[in-house]
């Protein structure tokens, strides 16, 4: 014969654990059904009666199955400096992430709580290591026979150009001037142009501190706390 | 509203069975989610849950208590009646009903009787 | 059955202090922890629910946070009409009061 299917509520074997998307209530000494995502308890277990669930609220989320007597509230409104990468809805958090031009300087455990302005390296200075989603840009003095003539978070510095008769030498945030007509690039190594990082979701990283901050740089913080972790985890 | 009102003996001798009533008004005790517990309150010390019934007649005692308390309810008449046998001069207190919501805290309380347990 | 250790038993404060009152449970309790509120001769009145949630009608100056075992009630400015006993109440499993914690001016 076949094992009896028990319906919730029911009493767990001695030692025995309740199934997927259930839980033990400690009061009624029963497993009980969770809600599902975008719902939460309105009333809990007894011995005879299950879990009554019900949806969450405008501007709160459940998204996990849970037993939470209520919904968590979602984050508030992205600030200026970020995108809403993902909505508010009955089953997710809103995600807010830094938009292009700035980077994740305090991440939280989705999106970004603090974005900061990305560093841009002044004239005489080339960007040594790209900023990212999560780290600012780390910029260099350009070395002898390079140049940057830009404030810039994404230039490098560039090669002179070489002349065959120099008019005027070049330095750090100048380019060489030649008199004759056809000057040459001498051809430094990862002389490249680098993109400007594109901003998708914060990892659990902190920013890299670096030298030559670019006056000016700017903090804003998004208002109001990131919402507590739910009450149960898991299915 | 919701109100909650408590009656029974102010005086009961020891070794007597203390029977109180909770009349109650607002809420009814067939709706999913309704519950009504006591909660005793010795003079001058802290709050004791004792027992309560929720809506679908499951019941719920102090582990302490348990062998001294009844529980029950009639719904047509919104009320609850807890039995307390074998009184003791320790059991002196002022008992309240309550209101439990769905999710199990005490929201709104009766304002209280008070009962003296002496020979 | 869980314990609930209130503390402190008993405090003093000025109008407009911050008055902070705990309680530790004896086993994780799912932050099912009320606080309530009573005046001499009155029923409890409840003031926070599920830790932090704040009942209709209530000042903000009252407040609760916590998780775990461990959970704490805030009087942010202390009021004349705040003075009162103080008594946390765990739902997590079955019901159990603190010891209270009464609040008096000094």
């Known amino acids: 014969l076949p094992a009896q299917v028990a319906f919730t509520p029911y009493a767990p074997e001695p030692g025995g654990t309740c199934r997927l998307r259930e839980y033990y209530d400690q009061t009624a000494q029963m497993c009980c059904s969770k809600c599902p995502p975008g719902q939460h308890a309105k009333v809990f277990c007894t011995k005879t009666s299950d879990t009554v669930c019900d949806s969450c609220e405008d501007s709160t989320y459940t998204q996990l199955w849970n037993w939470v007597p209520e919904c968590l509230s979602c984050g508030s409104r992205c600030s200026s400096d970020q995108v809403e990468t993902q909505a508010c809805t009955r089953e997710q958090n809103r995600i807010c992430t830094c938009r292009p031009g700035w980077y994740c300087a305090l991440s939280k455990q989705e999106g970004c709580r603090l974005c900061a302005q990305l560093r841009k390296c002044r004239p005489g200075f080339g960007v040594a290591r790209p900023g990212t989603e999560t780290s600012d840009v780390v910029c260099k003095p350009c070395a002898p026979g390079t140049f940057s003539n830009t404030t810039s978070s994404t230039d490098i510095c560039r090669p002179h150009q070489i002349c065959h008769v120099v008019a005027i030498p070049g330095n750090a945030s100048m380019d060489a001037v030649c008199t004759s007509t056809s000057p040459t690039r001498s051809m430094a190594p990862g002389a490249v142009h680098l993109p400007q990082p594109v901003s998708t979701r914060s990892q659990h990283t902190q920013p890299t501190p670096a030298p030559s901050t670019a006056p000016g740089t700017s903090f804003l913080l998004p208002v109001g706390p990131s919402p507590p972790a739910e009450g149960s985890t898991g299915d | 509203q919701v109100t909650l009102k408590e009656s029974g003996p102010a005086l009961v001798k020891p070794t007597q069975t203390l029977t109180l009533t909770c009349t109650f008004s607002?809420?009814?005790?067939?709706?999913?989610?309704?519950?009504v517990g006591w909660i005793r309150q010795p003079p001058g010390k802290a709050l004791e849950w004792l027992a309560h019934?929720?809506?679908?007649?499951?019941?719920f005692y102090n582990p302490s208590l348990k062998s001294r308390l009844t529980i029950s309810k009639d719904t047509s008449k919104n009320q609850v009646v807890l039995t307390m046998t074998n009184m003791d001069p320790v059991d002196t207190a002022t008992y309240y009903c309550?209101?439990?919501?769905?999710?199990?805290?005490?929201?709104?309380w009766g304002q209280g009787t008070t009962v003296t347990v002496s020979s | 059955d869980v314990q609930m250790t209130q503390s402190p038993s008993s405090l003093s404060a000025s109008v407009g202090d911050r008055v902070t009152i705990t309680c530790k449970a004896s086993q994780d309790i799912n932050k099912f922890i009320a606080w309530y509120q009573q005046k001499p001769g009155k029923a409890p009145k409840l003031l926070i629910h599920y830790t932090s949630t704040l009942q209709p009608g209530i000042p903000s100056r009252f407040s609760g946070s916590g998780s775990g075992r461990d959970y704490t009630f805030t009087i942010s400015s202390l009021q004349p009409e705040d003075i009162a006993t103080y008594y946390c109440l765990q739902y997590g499993n079955l019901w159990t009061f603190g010891g209270g914690t009464k609040v008096e001016i000094k």
């Open positions: 607002g809420f009814s005790l067939s709706t999913s989610g309704m519950g």
């Open positions: 019934i929720w809506w679908d007649d499951d019941k």
């Open positions: 309550a209101r439990l919501t769905g999710t199990r805290y005490f929201d709104y």
